[in-house]
Amino acid sequence: MMTGTIETTGNISAEKGGSIILQCHLSSTTAQVTQVNWEQQDQLLAICNADLGWHISPSFKDRVAPGPGLGLTLQSLTVNDTGEYFCIYHTYPDGTYTGRIFLEVLESSVAEHGARFQIP
């Protein structure tokens, strides 16, 4: 029986050009975490296998950093990064647990400020 729960950062926002840490935590189970997969809608971002280490998809290699821990740091954010992210915990003997994070990437406050208060 699967007793664990995934805690995530939930809905988060960050500025364009900045970075964000995607983090999930599995609790209430003694199951062993064998692997964590990080996914965005229809593509893989990264995998952290407990034995084999990290795999990072080529589309994200330039702006994804492994960690901290089983989390993922997404850098050089663009508005296109807005959307759902999933952490998929592969565990033994429980099976798979999935957590969801919604990231909204906002235009930077500097850009907003500049757009609203232009010098004539």
Epitope: T34, Q35, N37, E39, D42, Q43, L44, I47, N49, A50, D51, L52, G53, W54, H55, I56, S57, P58, S59, K61, P66, H90
Partner: antibody, heavy 119, light 107 residues
Framework: QVQLVQSGAEVKKPGASVKLSCKAS????????IYWVRQAPGQGLEWIGG????????NFNENFKSRATLTVDKSSSTAYMELSRLRSDDTAVYFC????????????WGQGTTVTVSS | DIQMTQSPSSLSASVGDRVTITCKAS??????VAWYQQKPGKAPKLLIY???YRYTGVPSRFSGSGSGTDFTFTISSLQPEDIATYYC?????????FGGGTKLEIK
């Protein structure tokens, strides 16, 4: 350039063990996992397992977990696979492979070692 | 374990033909799929990964696509040197598994 050079062909009796080697060169050995894949005659590819040379951690296909041992010798940049309690259906070509940078895909391959198990 | 079902298992085509091979995963594998080419007596070679990136030095006639459970490998214009067996492989979760292979022959 990256090279994986494997040991020569082996002929073994059922029940025996075999230890294959894979000598790596052209890159920093501890920075990339080594994986082992086998191919029985006329058959497809089967993943056996992998080893992380930096810490010795291993991950196996359950079909091989009880019989396969993966080790590395960092000083000689060599990976080893030992397969025990050999059976006739272990007759195959055994390949060592290396991943891409931060990638699990098998970017580099050794030339293969033929293992024949026959009484 | 995740099964990778590759089809067809063999195919015959003419030089210049467009050739398509499909691979279906028994469960979701996101984009964690690679394609390999193997010629008789040789080690496999990585062609395509993740699942649309051509590996270094691979000609542009080779391409791949897909996500989730359905993946496609295409040779846009078959060349004589493309005669080989092609395998798909998933690395979404261990044990990593290969398709059964597609043997490509020239008509």
């Amino acid at each position: 350039q990256v090279q994986l050079v494997q040991s020569g062909a082996e002929v073994k009796k059922p029940g025996a063990s075999v230890k294959l080697s894979c000598k790596a060169s052209g890159y920093t050995f501890i920075s990339y996992n080594i994986y082992w894949v086998r191919q029985a005659p006329g058959q497809g590819l089967e993943w056996i397992g992998g080893v992380n040379p930096s810490n010795g951690n291993t991950n196996f296909n359950e079909n091989f977990k009880s019989r396969a041992t993966l080790t590395v010798d960092k000083s000689s940049s060599t990976a080893y696979m030992e397969l025990s309690r050999l059976r006739s259906d272990d007759t195959a070509v055994y390949f060592c492979t290396r991943g891409n940078y931060y990638g699990y895909e098998f970017a580099y391959w050794g030339q293969g070692t033929t293992v024949t198990v026959s009484s | 374990d995740i099964q990778m079902t590759q089809s067809p298992s063999s195919l015959s085509a003419s030089v210049g033909d467009r050739v398509t091979i499909t691979c279906k995963a028994s469960q979701h594998v996101s984009t964690a799929v690679a394609w390999y080419q193997q010629k008789p007596g040789k080690a496999p070679k990585l062609l395509i990964y993740s699942p649309s990136y051509r590996y270094t030095g691979v000609p542009s006639r080779f391409s791949g696509s897909g996500s989730g459970t359905d993946f496609t490998f295409t040779i846009s214009s078959l060349q004589p040197e493309d005669i080989a067996t092609y395998y798909c492989q998933q690395h979404y979760s261990t044990p990593w598994t290969f398709g059964g292979g597609t043997k490509l022959e020239i008509k």
